[in-house]
């Protein structure tokens, strides 16, 4: 076999790695497996970042391509730009470097495109389908500071072998990044483990000054520690232990601090208290106590959904209006009939991390297809067309001339079309108020991939988040989610709110679905009360209307364990919907951050007409929203920017580290 | 010009063996994957499987693994198919093609090049 | 796998019509969608690549379009040299490749 084709690589600089992975993969495998390790897809934007990345690519065959971060939506050519329409997936369009392998050609670019990079010659950038599996990708890892490589040693037995942080073994290092480990191996027969590590006095360091192969006083056997041992002047030696690690009281082994679970999800050494605790992707540490961690709301951020979305603890579902079905994405909507058959069957395909397997995902997957149920429908405003992602970059519009998005009027009660994916009804015991803005902007229609959660112990049953057997082929029947369809009722005109009041039969028995609601409409604001809501099921919740004034809405209280729904009044921060000049975004967007409980699942129409203000549940401050591999999607009209207010906020409401196991909408990209 | 021309027609008895060449020019052999197609009559294409001439990696169509294997002769600029247990059904036209890296800027695996075809006839 | 079904299977036209060729895939495949061309005793020819791409020196009434599951092949005036059977082919799950049972043009 081909050296290039064997094994990962990466080259380091003092601030950032680069890394090769010959792995076969389409565009979304490649994203999520760089996510899975701490990185992204590479974004070479410097001429001195492209040589790094030539460099680490050298001279491989023609015929191999790896992919780079960047990805064009359908429809989104800007020819004259040097990314041509092209979005970094770090969600921007900034570069200093571009390597076309062909001039801008005007067309209409009709498809959704990826960029790929010439293995051989001078490694240009070629486009061409997202779904394609090419032979390898480049990721890209940042971090604190690095490490120098260590200066071999005359007592060494071999040259230091180097971990890094996203599981990278190599001795070809000049650099190492914060978290990486050095093994050195002495012709005495012993050895020394290195980290490189925060130094107290600033900076990063290795945790042991060198020599490190010199001296017998900690020989042999590293004279009892577990650790690094440490010879003394006196001759005698002492243990230390290497950081996120304290000596236990043996005085020669070392205890992990996280080992004693302090954190709810997931604890890394270090600090101030010897640990700190992190939340998994969908979640967010407690502001009460950084141990806990609560759900986000991605149905609060601007358009995780083309129309609307339902939100549940440690993620979301899509769903589309009457005459829409939901797109293979599970995102975008599009009109009844447009898309196959198979769509659901797509995207369980779609989305599986390898192929390895796909047989027998395929028939896991075809096991949900039965399990419809048909429901009374539910009311809902007709959603409105989306706007596009946030550009590093915004074209000027002369005054008259700023894009408008056509706002067909709220259509009362469109009703809600079925899922295409299994609604999961894994056991919640949060409660949340529930509040939905009826302006509540949106991200562009597209098929957004999901986020690949890190790695994560398991969590047990009780704190699952929701499966899709498609990807789990392999779980038993117990874990696998209930699914549910809605059925529309007769709509009354247009315009005219209707006055409902009806009372839905338990339609479900217990361990198979969330019980369904039973909804009031008065005026425009509907409040949802559940009828018996057995343990372990996650209800569904439909909330407000179109059109709300600010005010306190009702915001329901559920939780699973109790079967009565106490319904608390909530003063919820209004957000606010304006146009502006073309020298400001189209859209200000003003989100107060605020503590939120995890998150019951709540059903939101994803948009609705300008200049409007509406009560929105609160939500952490976001920057602008990232770019993301999606699939195929209509052509947005308009970008959307969300305004910064504080500038350590957390970029994205899906932090870095992963979900407990990722259904097919828990993870998307927002 | 690019060219992929195939060896001719076989006749063989259930139970034997093919080997179909397939010897490329006009272009760097190495930097092409080769694949090989086969057309029973009336019947739809069926991919068999891959050769990429760099590194002879190789990745077979499941139905024909076990019984199919696909070889490089660099030094040639020649892809062989070799297969096995040949059976009645295997008669067909089997086509080799080199599958593009690139057409104006973008990456494509579609295949550009076509060899004529070689007529496999099994027949007791 | 991934099944490719052509619609419709046979089709006559005169010299000068347009026509419209069907690839529906059994699940999505984005764009990595080609159209060929065979003629009776010959090899296929590469028309369209990735969906909706012309491949160097096909005339310009061929076109493509479509991505996901739905995929066409045009041909906005027929000339005597394009009565031949068309096939799509996917290439998504490379390099697993599956091709369309192929659409037969014939002259009315």
């Known amino acids: 076999q081909d050296p290039w084709a064997a094994e990962p690589r990466a080259a380091c600089g003092p601030s950032s790695c680069y890394a090769l992975f010959p792995r076969r993969r389409t565009f979304l495998e490649a994203w999520r497996a760089c996510r899975e390790l701490g990185g992204d897809l590479a974004t070479p934007r410097t001429p001195e970042e492209a040589q790094r990345v030539d460099s680490l690519v050298g001279a491989g065959p023609a015929s191999r391509l790896l992919w780079i971060g960047l990805q064009r939506q359908a429809r989104q050519c800007q020819l004259q730009r040097p990314l041509r329409g092209f979005t970094w997936t770090t969600g921007d369009q900034d570069t200093a470097f571009t390597n076309w392998a062909q001039p801008a050609s005007g067309g209409p670019c009709p498809a959704q495109r990826c960029v790929a990079l010439e293995a051989s010659g001078e490694h240009r950038w070629l486009e061409g389908s997202c779904t394609l599996a090419v032979d390898g990708y480049l990721c890209q890892f940042g971090f604190e500071g690095a490490c120098p490589a260590l200066q071999d040693e005359a007592g060494q037995a071999g040259p230091a072998v180097y971990t890094t942080p996203f599981h990278l073994v190599s001795t070809e290092f000049e650099w190492l990044p914060f978290g990486s480990v050095a093994a050195v191996q002495c012709q005495a027969g012993r050895g020394a483990s290195l980290l490189c590590v925060k130094q107290p006095e600033g900076g990063v360091g290795w945790s042991r000054a060198g020599p490190l192969c010199l001296g017998t006083g900690c020989s042999p056997d590293n004279g009892g520690c577990e650790h690094e041992c440490v010879e003394e002047v006196d001759g005698h030696v002492s243990c230390r232990c290497t950081e996120g690690f304290r000596l236990a009281a043996d005085g020669r082994s070392c205890e992990d601090p996280c080992a004693q679970a302090p954190c709810e999800q997931q604890c890394e050494p270090g600090g101030p208290q010897g640990y700190s605790c992190h939340c998994r992707l969908g979640f967010r540490p407690a502001e009460d106590d950084p141990h806990r961690c609560v759900d986000t709301d991605e149905c609060q951020i601007a358009g995780v959904c083309q129309q609307m979305c339902v939100n549940y603890v440690g993620g979301f579902e899509c769903y589309c209006s009457e005459g829409h079905e939901l797109e293979a994405d599970g995102i975008s909507c599009s009109p009844a009939g447009a898309m196959g058959a198979q769509a659901s069957q797509d995207l369980g395909d779609e989305l599986l991390d390898d192929g390895e397997d796909e047989e027998d995902e395929d028939e896991a997957w075809k096991a949900f297809n039965g399990g419809w149920t048909e429901m009374p429908g539910i009311l809902w405003m007709e959603p409105t067309q989306p706007p596009d992602f946030a550009l590093a970059y915004r074209p000027s519009f002369p005054e008259d001339r700023e894009p408008q998005i056509p706002y067909p009027e709220p259509t009362w009660p469109p009703p809600l079309s079925a899922p295409r994916v299994p609604y999961h009804s894994s056991v919640l015991s949060v409660t949340r108020p529930v509040v939905v803005s009826a302006t509540h902007p949106t991200l562009p229609s597209a098929h957004q991939p999901p986020v690949i959660p890190a790695t994560h112990p398991a969590l047990s049953r009780d704190h699952q988040i929701p499966v899709i057997a498609a990807n789990y082929p392999d779980l038993p029947s117990a874990y696998q989610p209930g699914i549910l369809s809605v059925s529309h009722s007769a709509q009354p005109p247009a315009h005219q709110p209707p006055m409902i009041s009806t009372k839905y039969p338990e339609l479900f028995p217990a361990h198979q679905s969330p019980m369904f609601p039973d909804t009031r409409v008065a005026g425009t604001q509907t409040t949802t009360h559940l009828p018996g809501i057995p343990p372990n099921h996650a209800p569904l919740v439909t909330t407000l209307g179109a059109q709300l004034p600010p005010q306190a809405p009702d915001a329901l209280v559920l939780r699973t364990q109790a079967t009565q729904l106490p319904i608390i009044p909530t003063a919820q921060p209004s957000l606010t919907t304006t146009s502006r000049s073309p020298v400001s975004p189209a859209h200000q967007i003003s989100v107060p951050a605020a503590t939120q409980p995890a998150a019951l699942p709540t059903l939101l129409p994803s948009q609705s007409p300008t200049n409007q203000t509406s009560p929105i549940s609160p939500t952490h401050p976001h920057s602008k929203a990232p770019q993301i591999p999606r699939e195929d999607g209509p052509s947005p009209k308009l970008a959307l920017w969300l305004p910064s207010p504080a500038p350590t906020a957390a970029p994205t409401a899906l932090g870095e580290a992963g979900l407990a196991e990722h259904s097919q909408r828990d993870d998307r990209w927002l | 010009q690019v060219q992929l021309v195939q060896s001719g027609p076989e006749v063989k008895k259930p139970g034997a063996s093919v080997k179909l060449s397939c010897k490329a020019s006009?272009?760097?052999?190495?930097?092409?994957?080769i694949h090989w197609v086969k057309q029973a009559p009336g019947q739809r294409l069926e991919w068999m499987g891959y050769?990429?001439?760099?590194?002879?990696?190789?990745t077979y169509n499941q139905k024909f693994k076990g019984r199919v294997t696909i070889t490089v002769d660099t030094s040639a600029s020649t892809a062989y198919m070799e297969l096995n247990s040949l059976r009645s059904e295997d008669t067909a036209v089997y086509y080799c093609a080199r599958r593009g890296n690139s057409y104006d800027g973008y990456f494509d695996y579609s295949m550009d090049y076509w060899g004529q075809g070689t007529l496999v006839t099994v027949s007791s | 796998d991934i099944q490719l079904t052509q619609s419709p299977s046979f089709l006559s036209a005169s010299v000068g019509d347009r026509v419209t060729i069907t690839c529906r895939a059994s699940q999505n495949v984005g764009t990595a969608v080609a159209w060929y061309q065979q003629k009776p005793g010959k090899a296929p020819k590469l028309l369209i690549y990735s969906a909706s791409n012309r491949y160097t020196g096909v005339p310009s009434r061929f076109s493509g379009s479509g991505s996901g599951t739905e995929f066409t092949l045009t041909i906005s005036s027929l000339q005597p040299e394009d009565f031949a059977t068309y096939y799509c082919?996917?290439?998504?799950?490379?390099?697993?490749?599956?091709f369309g049972q192929g659409t037969k043009l014939e002259i009315k």
């Open positions: 006009g272009y760097t052999f190495t930097d092409y994957v």
């Open positions: 082919q996917q290439y998504t799950n490379y390099p697993m490749y599956t």
């Open positions: 050769i990429n001439p760099y590194d002879d990696d190789t």
